[in-house]
Structures are given as structure tokens and as C-alpha cells.
Interface confidence: medium
């Protein structure tokens, strides 16, 4: 998103995700913010506060057990691409008070809005390496016990970080800096030179393969595990229905109406009313896509405190009863003994 | 090289709405920067009235509240302005001119159109 | 909106005279990004105004260096080394620092 629908192909200082209201009259330098900037705003403070503090300690209680244990890999490198995420949190927030004017340069507005892309196509990609996991501990017990290994889910995990950054290559070419004025300042958005057939084109693709595809596969996938674990009358399929449902579900309701409003920038004209509308609710949208960097722990907490009765025990304890019990393939039935099986599909599938 | 040329009446009455052309020549007004009109008053004082930018947002001096549209046709590299509802403290010439992000300043003008508002 | 007041409204001068423009802000021009967005433009009679000097101090292309800009926040300075002919007509000073950008009513060069 963040289109700047601009070209200045001749002036050497053009170096920017928001313009301005270009549309109504400039009453003043217009020293407050928009209603959706400050709810921007107070989302990312929130998401950044949970986010860091809740996926670090995800990253701490995990690292430890991520050689013997596979769940704990997959959580390890979720809560990692969540992490990263939160890391540009300060820097977006900081431009967004400023009313989007970008001092932080070029090279920053290229990396730092696309590690929520980045994070968006890791998420989405771990959590359909977690469901095929999940699928073939359900449907193929003996071919797990037999290759299922902690080597095999790092190279697993290797890919999808891989395919991740090829997916987010487009949003950090097209990204750069312009400036503007009345009043001056420096912006940070995607440029596509007036190229609508290419802004479509990457909005479909990140619509198509970080949301509706994943959407497709993943309902699929989970309707298959959990109608045979229904069958096998598994002991803790309502826990782990809900785990799921939570889980994917908050992948796809955060990233909703980013998805939608960035497919509709792309078809609009620039100028049209319904466009510099959806602009002014850009930030929000973005804001409200980095829930799912801080939802992940709150998540695994009320799942741990839900199997465990009460917050007994400490968070690190209780995030590691959830994050690293192991999968076990019983002999007679298929289906998974730990206590968050699905709970690995998680992580917020961005 | 950049050119800017002004057209439209000379001559309008009260009440009635003021439209002029600004035709571009050896730049495309989709290329980027700020299209603006700019007005000069009896006594030199200078006014700025409002511009659209390369993707077609406007912005307008909010003195002019609601009077003010300024459109442009891509495909003749012309933008207009529109001022409605004029009164005889319209009469002035105006202008329209590039503000030039390299400058950051109104670099390029129009020579200007006079027009005057009276019954 | 930022009022630009021009001092003096008239000056007389002979050919090769050295000629000094104030300008004055009613706010500081110093924008947060380090940048003053203080401008000059001559209008001679009959004919649009053409800028002379942008951002305080740098000369648009063509323009003699006998022209030079100066100053900083809410004063400013235009400065013309020697006089000559075709620099005889309006002075402008404007800012696009605040919204809307605003002119001041110009400085009359004339020959005494």
C-alpha cells in the first residue's frame, strides 16, 4: 500500500507510506492527527510493549529446546519473525506523530515498512510448514517417526524464511522516498511510476498468496486433522479446535483489512474520493496487521493457563509446558499427546 | 525548456464563476511536482490560490473556502482553476505556475491573464 | 498565515549602486528538517515574477551572482552588488515553509 502514484525523473534530491490530505482545504499547518493516526498509534505502543516483551521471552523459553524438540523449533522462529517485526514499531511510530514525515533516510524506508511483509509471508509460510506437520503426525505416523527430526524442520523453517524474502523483494524495490511540501516534508511509500498493470500485480500476488491461498490450504488441512481426530475421539480435541480456530483465525481477521483495502488502492484512480479515503485509514490498517506480532504469546498464555486450570506456575514455565512438549506418535491411534499440538499451527500465519 | 501560458475571459460579472486555462509545454503535469494558481491583487499583493499535484489531490488557501476547484486534462497537459461565486475583489491576474521540488519554490510562471469582475 | 513585511517599499538607486531588501517573517521560517524555505523573485513591469533566489542563499539558474541572499529564522536579506538596468522592478519575498506559502508586498527598485 502506500502508493505514491508519482515520477519525478528530473530533479537529483528525490529520495518516501502516507501523503497528505491533498484533497481538503490546508486551514492550518494541521498540528493534529487524525483519529485513525491515533489509534495507529496507540495499537503499535501496545503491539510493540507485548510484542517485544512476549516474543523475547517466546524466543528465551524455546532457544534452549529447540535441538531436541520440534515444536519448540517452530515457535522459536515464528516468535523470531514477530520480533523483527516489532523492531521498526518505534521508527513507524515516531513518523506517524510526525504526521509521516520520513528523516530517517532512503535505505530505512526501504527495510523497515517491509518487515511486516516480511513477517506476513514468514508467518504464513511456517504456519503451512506447522500444518503439514500437524497433517502428517495425523495421517502419516510411521513416516513421521521415521524422518520427523530436528534437522529436516530447520531446513523446513530455512525455506520458508528463503521464499519470505523473495516474496517481499517487490515491496522493498518499489519503496522510496520523496519529498513534499505545503508544508515541507519527506514521505515514505511504494512508487510504481504510474504502472497500474504492476501495482495491481504485486497487491494481487500478496493478496493471493499471503491470504487466500493460505486461507484455502489451511482450512482444508485443519478440517482433515480435526474430523480425524474427532473420530479417534482424541481426549483433547475441543482444546485443541480452539487453539486452532484462535490461532489461524487471528492470522487472517489482522491482515483482513489490509489485504482489502491495498487491492482496492490498487484498482482505484488516485484521485478519486473512495482512494484518498482509504489512505487516510492506511496506517490503521497497517497498525491493526502488527496485532499479529504480539498475539502469538497472549495467546500461548491463555491456552497454557486454559489446559492448566489456573496460572499456577511461572510464564517461562508455563510457555514451556505449551511451546516444547513434543509430539508423540502413539502406536495405536494417530493423533498427537501434546497439549498444544495445533497450538504449533499458530503464529499468527501472516 | 518549461512553459506555462495562461487563457480564458478577461471580463466577468458578479456572481458568476471565473475559469482560465493553463496550458503546459516541455513537461508533463503527471511527471510531478505542484501545479499552482497564484493571483495578484490591485497593490501588488500576491496570492496563493491553490495547486494539483502530479496524481491529481488538490490543495486549496482556505481564504478562498469553498469557492475554489482546480482540475486539470491530462491528455492536453492543461489544468484550470474555477472560482465561483466571484465578487469585484476577484479582479486581479493570475497566474499559473510550477512549484519545483528541486527549488522548492514557484520556479516557473505564466505571463499572466487580467481579469476583471464587473457588471 | 505568515506575514512577510518588506522593508523598504521603495528603493531609489543609481546604476552600480549596491542595494539591500529586508524581508521579515512573522514566524521563524527554520523548518524541523534543517531547511529554510525563504525565497526571492523579481517581477519587472508587465511581465510574471521570475525567481531569483531560493532557500535563503542558492541563485536559480542564469541569475548574475551579483545577487546574493542571506539570513536566518525571520530575517532576510537580498543583497544586488551593483545596480543595473534590467534589475530595475518589484522584489518579492516568499516563504513555503508554513501553509499557505505567502508573499510579502514587494520592494519597488527605482532609479533616483
Known amino acids: 500500500m502506500d502508493s505514491f502514484n508519482y515520477t519525478t525523473p528530473d530533479y537529483g534530491h528525490y529520495d518516501d507510506k502516507d501523503t497528505l490530505d491533498l484533497n481538503t482545504p490546508v486551514d492550518k499547518t494541521s498540528n493534529t492527527l487524525r483519529v485513525p493516526d491515533i489509534l495507529a498509534l496507540v495499537i503499535f505502543a501496545v503491539v510493540f510493549l507485548v510484542g517485544v516483551l512476549g516474543n523475547a521471552l517466546v524466543v528465551w523459553v524455546t532457544a534452549f529446546e529447540a535441538k531436541r524438540t520440534i515444536n519448540a523449533i517452530w515457535f522459536l522462529n515464528l516468535a523470531v519473525a514477530d520480533f523483527l517485526s516489532c523492531l521498526a514499531l518505534p521508527i513507524l511510530f515516531t513518523s506517524i506523530v510526525q504526521h509521516h514525515h520520513w528523516p530517517f533516510g532512503g535505505a530505512a524506508c526501504s527495510i523497515l515498512p517491509s518487515l511486516i511483509l516480511l513477517n506476513m509471508y514468514a508467518s504464513i509460510l511456517l504456519l503451512a510448514t506447522i500444518s503439514a506437520d500437524r497433517f502428517l503426525l495425523v495421517f502419516k505416523p510411521i513416516w513421521c517417526q521415521n524422518f520427523r527430526g530436528a534437522g529436516l524442520a530447520w531446513i523446513a523453517c530455512a525455506v520458508a524464511w528463503g521464499l519470505a524474502l523473495l516474496l517481499t523483494i517487490p515491496s522493498f524495490l518499489y519503496r522510496v522516498v520523496r519529498e513534499e511540501y505545503f508544508p515541507p516534508k519527506v514521505l515514505c511509500g511504494v512508487d510504481y511510476s504510474h504502472d497500474k498493470r504492476r501495482e495491481r500485480a504485486v497487491a494481487i500476488v500478496r493478496l493471493v498468496l499471503g491470504f487466500l491461498w493460505p486461507l484455502l490450504t489451511l482450512t482444508i488441512c485443519y478440517t482433515f486433522i480435526l474430523l480425524r481426530t474427532w473420530s479417534r475421539r482424541a481426549t483433547r480435541s475441543t482444546k485443541t479446535l480452539k487453539v486452532v480456530v484462535a490461532v489461524v483465525a487471528s492470522f487472517f481477521i489482522f491482515w483482513l483489512p489490509y489485504q482489502v483495502t491495498g487491492i482496492m488502492m490498487s484498482f482505484l484512480e488516485p484521485s478519486s474520493p473512495t482512494f484518498l479515503l482509504l489512505k487516510k485509514l492506511d496506517s490503521l490498517c497497517v497498525s491493526f496487521a502488527y496485532i499479529n506480532c504480539c498475539i502469538n504469546p497472549i495467546i500461548y498464555v491463555v491456552a497454557g493457563q486454559g489446559f492448566q486450570g489456573r496460572l499456577r506456575k511461572s510464564l517461562p514455565s508455563l510457555l514451556r509446558n505449551v511451546l516444547t512438549e513434543e509430539s508423540v506418535v502413539r502406536e495405536s491411534k494417530s493423533f498427537t499427546r501434546s497439549t498444544v499440538d495445533t497450538m504449533a499451527q499458530k503464529t499468527q500465519a501472516v | 525548456d518549461i512553459q506555462l501560458q495562461e487563457s480564458g475571459p478577461g471580463l466577468v460579472k458578479p456572481s458568476q464563476s471565473l475559469s482560465l486555462t493553463c496550458s503546459v509545454t516541455g513537461y508533463s503535469i503527471t511527471s510531478g511536482h505542484y501545479w499552482n494558481w497564484i493571483r495578484q491583487l490591485p497593490g501588488n499583493k500576491m496570492e496563493w490560490m491553490g495547486h494539483?499535484?502530479?496524481?491529481?489531490?488538490?490543495r486549496y488557501n482556505p481564504s478562498l473556502k469553498n469557492r475554489i476547484s482546480i482540475t486539470r486534462d491530462t491528455s492536453k497537459n492543461q489544468f484550470f482553476l474555477k472560482l465561483n461565486s466571484v465578487t469585484t475583489e476577484d479582479t486581479a491576474t493570475y497566474y499559473c505556475?510550477?512549484?519545483?521540488?528541486?527549488?522548492?519554490?514557484?520556479?516557473?510562471w505564466g505571463q499572466g491573464t487580467l481579469v476583471t469582475v464587473s457588471a | 498565515d505568515v506575514v512577510m513585511t518588506q522593508t523598504p517599499l521603495s528603493l531609489p538607486v543609481s546604476l552600480g549602486d549596491q542595494a539591500s531588501i529586508s524581508c521579515r517573517s512573522s514566524q521563524s521560517l527554520l523548518h524541523s528538517n534543517g531547511n529554510t524555505y525563504l525565497h526571492w523573485y523579481l517581477q519587472k513591469p508587465g511581465q510574471s515574477p521570475k525567481l531569483l533566489i531560493y532557500k535563503v542563499s542558492t541563485r536559480f539558474s542564469g541569475v548574475p551572482d551579483r545577487f546574493s541572499g542571506s539570513g536566518s529564522g525571520a530575517d532576510f536579506t537580498l543583497q544586488i552588488s551593483r545596480v543595473e538596468a534590467e534589475d530595475l522592478g518589484v522584489y518579492l519575498c516568499s516563504q513555503s515553509t508554513h501553509v499557505p506559502p505567502t508573499f510579502g508586498a514587494g520592494t519597488k527598485l527605482v532609479l533616483t
Open positions: 505556475a510550477l512549484f519545483y521540488f528541486a527549488y522548492a519554490s514557484f520556479a516557473y
Open positions: 494539483i499535484s502530479n496524481d491529481g489531490s488538490n
